[in-house]
């Protein structure tokens, strides 16, 4: 969490970002508050980028003004325009690039003063793993997959039973580019597995830690997986 | 109410280039909306093949991002589709469509739609 | 790319009963949605965006729902002008992919 405030105390007002990460081909959200104003047509929203001479987005008087944008963000920004009278300054990011990482500047004007907050934005791709029995193999093994991760991630197999196992030895992982030669497809492969056990596939990068469950039974299958960004500090 | 147009060949000879022009009216492609191309194969799914804002900017499907160019003519009110090294697979209807942003939604979803024009590929 | 699948491929309903059209996406494309209405001839036609928001002009009686990978569209009383092909498309990625279409067809 990043809070800024403005030079001089009387006229300063508080700006709050939380820096983030941005899945690559989706669309992202940069997100920043401030105190707000009663009056709309009293507040200005600039959006900036480090090493990038015109603006991200300015919204002012109600409206986006879009004269002095940036030709990388040409079409690709909004603010939540319904959203501004309360506070909410955070800008969406159409169909974001590894470009697009950065230090972005949230300006604020209102009639009670101004303020600013940098947000830290990186870019990759992270995605959910799915965990299945892989009944082709000739043993019982499990095989782990993700569609889409960058920059290339670590996996690491855990089990609730063998704690502190290390399953290197038993294990096979590979990376498979996607179509648009930056993403890659992640597949794991655990052999040798037990029944009556949970086993864990962990993928984690700078941006993304990724964990799904499988716990096998004679009886059922049950799965379960969660995705955590890393870096979402707010300033 | 905004309208589009596609208008263009409807044979194209294979190895050729496939080349469609949209006209907007009703309203101004200098909007916030990015305008599309899709295409439809003669009795199969839908295709997204790219899209247009009026600043130039382009996004293009990975599986044709090699032979298509989208363009757009602000002063005629109209964008365009050029599809190179055509085979047969290319032979489809061609639709227009402008994505349906409005402040603060996502972009993505396409509200108006050109009747769209079929072009086929054959010697 | 993010794979659509629609189910079932047809579904034939009477005229005033319920159609209940499935759509899953290969991975999350959280409510980023469509649903349109093809007619024989005629381009599609917006029905629903942000997998719940009717479009300007649409009946009541079309409704959408889900978020993430599972997503539902409901006609609550079939009228004859409904019978049409409909498709779900993804917005969450680029590039936008559309499902390969339910032909709704009269019982």
């Known amino acids: 969490l990043i809070i800024g405030f403005g030079i001089s105390g009387r006229h300063s007002i508080t700006v709050t970002t939380v820096a983030s990460a941005g899945n690559i081909g989706e669309d992202g959200i940069l997100s920043c508050t401030f105190e707000p104003d009663i009056k709309l047509s009293d507040i200005v929203i600039q959006w900036l980028k480090e090493g990038v001479i015109g603006l991200v987005h300015e919204f002012k008087e109600g409206k986006d003004e879009l004269s002095e944008q940036d030709e990388m963000f040409r079409g690709r920004t909004a603010v939540f325009a319904d959203q501004v009278i309360v506070g909410n300054a955070s800008l969406r990011l159409k169909n974001v690039q590894l470009t697009d990482a950065g230090t972005y500047k949230c300006y604020i004007i209102t009639s009670k003063g101004k303020g600013n907050a940098n947000l830290e934005y990186k870019t990759g791709a992270f995605s959910m793993p799915e965990v299945n029995v892989d009944y082709n193999a000739s043993s019982e093994t499990l095989r782990c997959e993700a569609p889409r991760w960058f920059p290339q991630p670590t996996v690491v197999w855990a089990s609730q039973v063998d704690q502190g196992a290390n399953f290197s030895e038993v294990s096979n992982t590979s990376f498979e580019l996607n179509s648009e030669n930056v993403t890659m497809k992640v597949v794991s492969v655990l052999y040798n597995v037990t029944i009556n056990n949970t086993y864990s596939c962990m993928i984690e990068n700078d941006i993304a830690k990724a964990t799904g469950d499988i716990k096998v039974t004679e009886s059922e299958i049950k799965r379960r997986s969660h995705l955590q960004l890393l870096n979402s500090k707010a300033s | 109410q905004v309208q589009l147009q596609e208008s263009g060949p409807g044979l194209v000879k294979p190895s050729g280039t496939l080349s469609l022009t949209c006209a907007v009216s009703?309203?101004?492609?200098?909007?916030?909306?990015?305008w599309s191309w899709v295409r439809q194969p003669p009795g199969k799914g839908l295709e997204a093949i790219g899209e247009?804002?009026?600043?130039?900017?382009?996004n293009y499907n990975p599986s044709l991002k090699s032979r298509v160019t989208i363009s757009v003519d602000k002063s005629k009110n109209q964008f365009s589709l050029k599809l190179s090294s055509v085979t047969a697979a290319d032979t489809a209807i061609y639709y227009c469509?402008?994505?349906?942003?409005?402040?603060?939604?996502?972009?993505?979803?396409?509200?108006?739609w050109g009747q769209g024009t079929l072009v086929t590929v054959s010697s | 790319e993010i794979v659509m699948t629609q189910s079932p491929a047809t579904l034939s309903v009477s005229p005033g009963e319920r159609a209940t059209l499935s759509c899953r996406a290969s991975q999350s494309v959280n409510s980023n949605l469509a649903w349109y209405q093809q007619k024989p001839g005629q381009a599609p036609w917006l029905l629903i965006y942000?997998?719940?928001t009717r479009a300007t002009g649409i009946p009541a009686r079309f409704s959408g729902s889900g978020s993430g990978t599972e997503f539902t569209l409901t006609i609550s009383s079939l009228q004859s002008e409904d019978f049409a092909v409909y498709y779900c498309q993804q917005y969450n990625h680029w590039p936008y992919t559309f499902g390969q279409g339910t032909k709704l067809e009269i019982k």
């Open positions: 942000g997998a719940s």
């Open positions: 009703g309203g101004s492609i200098s909007s916030s909306n990015w």
């Open positions: 469509a402008r994505d349906g942003y409005s402040s603060g939604w996502y972009w993505g979803y396409f509200d108006y």
């Open positions: 247009i804002y009026h600043s130039g900017n382009t």
